[in-house]
Interface confidence: low
C-alpha cells in the first residue's frame, strides 16, 4: 500500500480539531491580478504582500496595487496601502528587503512618463512606516544593498549610470557613467564594467572592469577586454577576450582584482559560455559550455586558488547562456550536489556527488518503486530527479528539489525511476540520508515544504482543479495525514513558509472564483498544537553522515572528516523549536589519495584513485602563469582538495618555484593598472 495508508502509521491524535483551531483565513479585498510576498527579517513574523492589478484601457494600461502587512506569520493582514500614498508599485523590481534583520524595505513606484526620475518608498522599521523619496534618475534595476552595511545602496539607471546612496536611499550620487553591470563585493567594495564606444552590447568583449572601495571617491581599473565578470565565494572571475581571435578565457583573482591568474580551463568561442554553478571560500564549480548548440558542457572543480581545475563531470546539461541547468546544492548534507547529464542517446539522466564533485554516480533506485519503460533491465535502474530543466520544458513538475541546512539529511524531489528522466507524471521521492537512499513519498506531483527543521513536512497536490486539502507528515514522509482546511475549494497558487524551515506556520495562497469576481485568499495553518511538546534528549538519535559501510574504520569520511549528528527520531512527535541548532560532532580522518585532486598537468583515469601525467605534458617542465609571473611546478601529481581536513596518512609532495619571468596572458598586469580619484 502507498505510504501513509497501512495500519502501522501512527495517527496524530485529534489533529483535525487542533488544526481547525489554528487555521486562519484572510480574504484580500482585491481583484485577482498578481501577488508577491516577502518576509521581512528573520523570526519577526512580518510578511509584506503586494497585489497588483492591470486594467487595460484603450490608450494605456491603468495599474492598481495594494500593500498588506502581517506581523503574526500571515494569520492576519492589515491593508497599509495608505502608507505608500496609494501609489502603484512596480512588480518587476519586487520588494527589496534588506539583509539580515535590518528591517529595511524599498519599494519602487511607477511614475508618469514626463517625470525627471523615479520614486521609491523606504522603510527601516519592518514596514511599519514608509518615507517617499523622489530619485534623480530612473532605475533600471532593483536597489542592491551592501551585504556589510544596509545603509549603502547601489542601482543602475536607465541611462547606464551607476548610482550610490550612503544613507539608505535618502540621497543619491552618480559615481560613474556608461556602466553595464555592478555588484557588491566584500568590505563595501563595488565592482562594475564600463563601455567606451557606444553600448554594453556593442562593447561586449571590450569592456573595462573597475573597482571602488570607497563608494566612488576613487577608482581602479582592474581589467580590460572584459566580456563579463562574476563573484563566487572569495573568488573574482572575469572572462577576457583573447588577443588574436574571438575566444575568451577565465581569469581569477583572490585579492579583489589586484592580481590575476589565468584559470586552467578551456577557452570558449562566441556562442559558448562559462557559468559559476556554485562557489564557497574553498573552491568553485565551473561549467564550460561545449562548442555548438549541444545543450551540454563540462563541470570542472577548482583548487583552493581557483586556478587549477579538475574535470568533474562530462556532458553536463545546461541549455544556453542564462538557460536551464539542474545543478542543485543539497544543503542538508555537506559535499552533496545533484545535476543532470545529457547521455549519448539524448536522454537525460540524474547524477549525484557526495564528495564535492570528486566522483559522480547515479541515484540508487528506491526500494518501493519499479523501473519504468526507460529501463533496459527491469531490475536495475536509477532514480532520476526533475529540476529546473523539466520545469522549463513544462513537464508536470511544480517544484524543484528541496533541502534545508537545519533539516539534516532530508532531500525531497520529483522523480522517475528508470534509465533516464521520464515524461510521465512524476512522483515525489524523499531521502533521509542526503541522497544515498530514496523512498517514494507521494504519488503524483505536489508542492512541498519543510517546517520545524524537518519535524513536519507539508504537501499539497498539484492539480488544475480547486483544492481544499493539505497533507502533512511528522515522520519524514513515511506516513501522511490529510486535513481539509476549507469547505470551499480554492484555486491554489502557492505555499509560503518562512525561509529557513524553522517556522511551524504554513500559508496556502490561492484565489476564489465566483460568477462576478475572483479574489486572493490565504489560509495560514499553525502546526504548533500538532507538535504539542518540546523535544527532549530521548527524542534524538546519533546518525553518522555519509555512512556506507559501518565495518570500515574510515566509514563516513568525506573531505577528510566525518560528522555525527543528533537527529530527531522518526517516531518522535515533538517540536524542535525556532531556536533549534543542528548538533554535530566532527572527527578528522587519515589522508588517502581520495583527499587529493590531480595537480596541473595530471589527470585521473576512470575508476582509479591515482593521478597520472597527461601524455602531452610528459617530460615537459610544468610552467604556468600565476599572478603575472611564470611559475615552475614540482609535483608528483596531487593537490589537497579545497576544504579537505584530513591529517596523516598519505602525503604527496608539491612545490612551486617563482621563475621570476613576467607573463601577462593578454590581461592587465598589476604594474600597468591605473587608478583615478573623483
Amino acid at each position: 500500500s502507498a505510504p501513509g495508508e497501512d495500519e502501522e502509521c501512527g495517527r496524530v491524535r485529534d489533529f483535525v480539531a487542533k488544526l481547525a483551531n489554528n487555521t486562519h483565513q484572510h480574504v484580500f479585498d482585491d481583484l485577482r491580478g498578481s501577488v508577491s510576498l516577502s518576509w521581512v527579517g528573520d523570526s519577526t513574523g512580518v510578511i509584506l504582500v503586494l497585489t497588483t492589478f492591470h486594467v487595460p484601457l484603450v490608450i494605456m494600461t491603468f495599474g492598481q496595487s495594494k500593500l498588506y502587512r502581517s506581523e503574526d506569520y500571515g494569520k492576519n493582514f492589515k491593508d497599509i496601502t495608505d502608507l505608500i500614498n496609494n501609489t502603484f508599485i512596480r512588480t518587476e523590481f519586487g520588494m527589496a528587503i534588506g539583509p539580515e534583520n535590518s528591517g529595511k524595505v524599498v519599494l519602487t513606484a511607477e511614475v508618469s512618463g514626463g517625470s525627471r526620475g523615479g520614486r521609491i518608498f523606504r522603510s527601516s522599521d519592518f514596514a511599519k512606516n514608509f518615507v517617499q523619496t523622489d530619485l534623480p534618475f530612473h532605475p533600471l534595476t532593483q536597489m542592491m544593498y551592501s551585504p556589510q552595511n544596509s545603509d549603502y545602496l547601489l542601482a543602475l539607471s536607465t541611462e547606464n549610470g551607476l548610482w550610490v546612496s550612503k544613507n539608505f536611499g535618502g540621497k543619491w550620487e552618480e559615481i560613474h557613467k556608461a556602466v553595464c553591470l555592478a555588484k557588491w563585493g566584500s568590505d563595501n567594495t563595488i565592482f562594475f564594467t564600463t563601455y567606451a564606444n557606444g553600448s554594453c552590447k556593442a562593447d561586449l568583449g571590450a569592456l573595462e572592469l573597475w573597482r571602488t572601495s570607497d563608494l566612488g571617491k576613487s577608482f581602479k581599473t582592474i581589467g580590460v577586454k572584459i566580456y563579463s565578470f562574476g563573484l563566487g565565494g572569495r573568488f573574482l572571475f572575469a572572462s577576457v577576450m583573447a588577443d588574436k581571435d574571438t575566444t575568451r578565457r577565465i581569469h581569477v583573482s583572490t585579492d579583489q582584482g589586484d592580481t590575476w591568474s589565468m584559470a586552467q580551463l578551456p577557452s570558449v568561442g562566441q556562442e559558448q559560455f562559462y557559468s559559476i554553478l556554485a562557489a564557497n571560500d574553498d573552491m568553485v564549480f565551473m561549467h564550460v559550455d561545449e562548442p555548438g548548440d549541444t545543450g551540454f558542457g563540462t563541470i570542472f572543480t577548482s583548487d583552493d586558488r581557483g586556478i587549477v581545475y579538475s574535470k568533474s563531470l562530462d556532458r553536463h546539461l545546461y541549455t544556453t547562456t542564462g538557460g536551464e541547468t539542474d545543478f542543485t546544492n543539497v544543503t542538508s548534507l555537506r559535499g552533496v550536489y545533484i545535476t543532470s547529464v545529457l547521455s549519448e542517446d539524448n536522454s537525460i539522466q540524474t547524477m549525484i556527488t557526495f564528495d564535492q564533485g570528486g566522483r559522480w554516480t547515479h541515484l540508487r533506485k528506491p526500494e518501493n518503486s519499479e523501473c519504468d519503460a526507460t529501463a533496459k533491465n527491469k531490475n536495475e535502474c536509477s532514480l532520476h530527479i526533475h529540476a529546473s530543466y523539466s520545469i522549463s520544458q513544462k513537464l508536470n513538475v511544480p517544484m524543484a528539489p528541496l533541502s534545508e541546512p537545519n533539516a539534516v539529511g532530508i532531500v525531497i524531489a520529483h522523480g522517475s525511476v528508470g534509465d533516464a528522466i521520464s515524461v510521465m507524471v512524476p512522483d515525489v521521492y524523499i531521502s533521509d540520508d542526503g541522497g544515498y537512499s530514496w523512498t517514494k513519498m507521494l504519488e503524483g506531483p505536489h508542492y512541498y515544504t519543510i517546517l520545524d527543521s524537518g519535524g513536519i513536512i507539508v504537501a499539497i497536490e498539484h492539480s488544475s482543479r480547486p483544492i481544499n486539502v493539505i497533507k502533512f507528515s511528522t515522520d519524514e514522509g513515511q506516513c501522511w495525514q490529510t486535513y481539509t482546511f476549507t469547505r470551499d475549494p480554492i484555486y491554489f497558487t502557492g505555499l509560503a513558509s518562512e525561509p529557513g524551515a524553522r517556522s511551524m506556520n504554513i500559508s496556502i495562497w490561492g484565489f476564489t472564483e465566483s460568477f462576478l469576481t475572483s479574489q486572493w485568499v490565504s489560509y495560514t495553518i499553525d502546526f504548533k498544537d500538532i507538535l504539542e511538546r518540546n523535544c527532549e534528549e530521548k527524542d534524538y538519535t546519533i546518525w553518522l553522515a555519509h555512512s556506507t559501510d559501518p565495518e570500515d574504520y574510515e566509514d563516513g569520511c568525506i573531505l577528510g572528516y566525518k560528522e555525527q549528528f543528533l537527529r530527531l527520531r522518526k517516531s518522535s512527535v515533538c517540536q524542535n523549536g525556532r531556536d533549534y541548532v543542528v548538533t554535530k560532532q566532527p572527527s578528522i580522518c587519515l589522508c588517502s589519495l581520495e583527499d587529493f585532486l590531480c595537480d596541473f598537468g595530471y589527470y585521473r583515469p576512470e575508476n582509479d584513485s591515482k593521478c597520472v601525467e597527461q601524455p602531452e605534458l610528459k617530460g615537459h617542465d610544468l610552467e604556468f602563469c600565476l599572478y603575472g609571473r611564470e611559475e615552475h611546478l614540482t609535483t608528483n601529481g596531487y593537490r589537497k582538495i579545497p576544504g579537505d581536513k584530513c591529517q596523516g596518512g598519505v602525503n604527496p609532495v608539491r612545490e612551486v618555484k617563482d621563475l621570476k619571468k613576467k607573463c601577462t596572458s593578454n590581461f592587465l598586469s598589476p604594474e600597468k593598472q591605473n587608478s583615478k580619484s573623483n
Partner: antibody, heavy 117, light 108 residues
Framework: EVQLVESGGGLVQPGGSLRLSCAAS????????MSWVRQAPGKGLEWVAT????????YYPDILKGRFTISRDNAKNSLYLQMNSLRAEDTAVYYC??????????WGQGTLVTVSS | DIQMTQSPSSLSASVGDRVTITCRVS??????LAWYQQKPGKSPKLLVY???NLADGVPSRFSGSGSGTDYTLTISSLQPEDFATYYC??????????FGQGTKLEIK
C-alpha cells in the same frame, strides 16, 4: 506472465454508452500507469486515455474529453473505460496496454466496439 | 500538439533486405520515442523504447536510432515473420502521445 484481457465490447447504438474492462495479471498492477488505445477498421493506432498508477491522474486527447472516462480498481487489478454519447466514428478495436513510462510495453488482444443503428 | 510524420506509408521488400522506416517529429522529443509492430488481426507489440533500446525478446536484427526530431527503425535482414505494419509513438511533454500513421511492410 503479463496478461491483459479486455471485455465489454459489442454493438451499441449512436448516443449509447458502453463500459470496457481490462483484467490484468502476472505483474504488480498498482505500480504501473495504464492506457487505452483504439484502432478503427483498416486505420492506424489512436491513443485514447491514460491513468496513473494510483488513479490520481487521467489524460485524454482533446477530442475525447468529456465523453470517455478512464478509471481503475487496484484491489481488483482492473482497468475500465466508460464511453458515453457514442458515435459511428468511435467504432474500433479497443486495446488496453500497460504504460510504465516511455512506451506501452504489453497489450491486450483487444475488444471490438461497433456503433451503428 | 506534437506532429508525427512516418515514412514511407508502405514499402515492398524481399527476405534478406535491409529496411529503414523513419519518423519525423515536429519538435525535439529527446529520444522519448517507441516503435511497435502489428500483424493483421493481432495486437501491437513493443519493439523499441527510448529511441534505441530493444524490448525484451525482440530479435537483434531490429534496431532504433536517432535523436532530436528524426528517428529511424532499421531491420538489418528482413525475415518472413517481419512483414507487418510498424508504428512510432512519442512520449515527450504532456499528452497527447501521438502515433505515427503507420508503415505497411509487404513482400515484394
Amino acid at each position: 506472465e503479463v496478461q491483459l484481457v479486455e471485455s465489454g465490447g459489442g454493438l451499441v447504438q449512436p448516443g449509447g454508452s458502453l463500459r470496457l474492462s481490462c483484467a490484468a495479471s502476472g505483474f504488480t498492477f498498482n505500480i504501473y500507469g495504464m492506457s487505452w488505445v483504439r484502432q478503427a477498421p483498416g486505420k492506424g493506432l489512436e491513443w485514447v486515455a491514460t491513468i496513473s498508477s494510483g488513479g490520481i491522474y487521467t489524460y485524454y486527447p482533446d477530442i475525447l474529453k468529456g465523453r470517455f472516462t478512464i478509471s481503475r480498481d487496484n484491489a481488483k487489478n482492473s482497468l475500465y473505460l466508460q464511453m458515453n454519447s457514442l458515435r459511428a466514428e468511435d467504432t474500433a478495436v479497443y486495446y488496453c496496454a500497460r504504460h510504465p513510462g516511455g512506451a506501452m510495453d504489453y497489450w491486450g488482444q483487444g475488444t471490438l466496439v461497433t456503433v451503428s443503428s | 500538439d506534437i506532429q508525427m510524420t512516418q515514412s514511407p506509408s508502405s514499402l515492398s521488400a524481399s527476405v534478406g533486405d535491409r529496411v529503414t522506416i523513419t519518423c519525423r517529429v515536429s519538435e525535439n522529443i529527446y529520444s522519448n520515442l517507441a516503435w511497435y509492430q502489428q500483424k493483421p488481426g493481432k495486437s501491437p507489440k513493443l519493439l523499441v523504447y527510448a529511441a534505441t533500446n530493444l524490448a525484451d525478446g525482440v530479435p537483434s536484427r531490429f534496431s532504433g536510432s536517432g535523436s532530436g526530431t528524426d528517428y529511424t527503425l532499421t531491420i538489418s535482414s528482413l525475415q518472413p515473420e517481419d512483414f507487418a505494419t510498424y508504428y512510432c509513438q512519442h512520449f515527450w511533454g504532456t499528452p497527447p502521445w501521438t502515433f505515427g500513421q503507420g508503415t505497411k511492410l509487404e513482400i515484394k
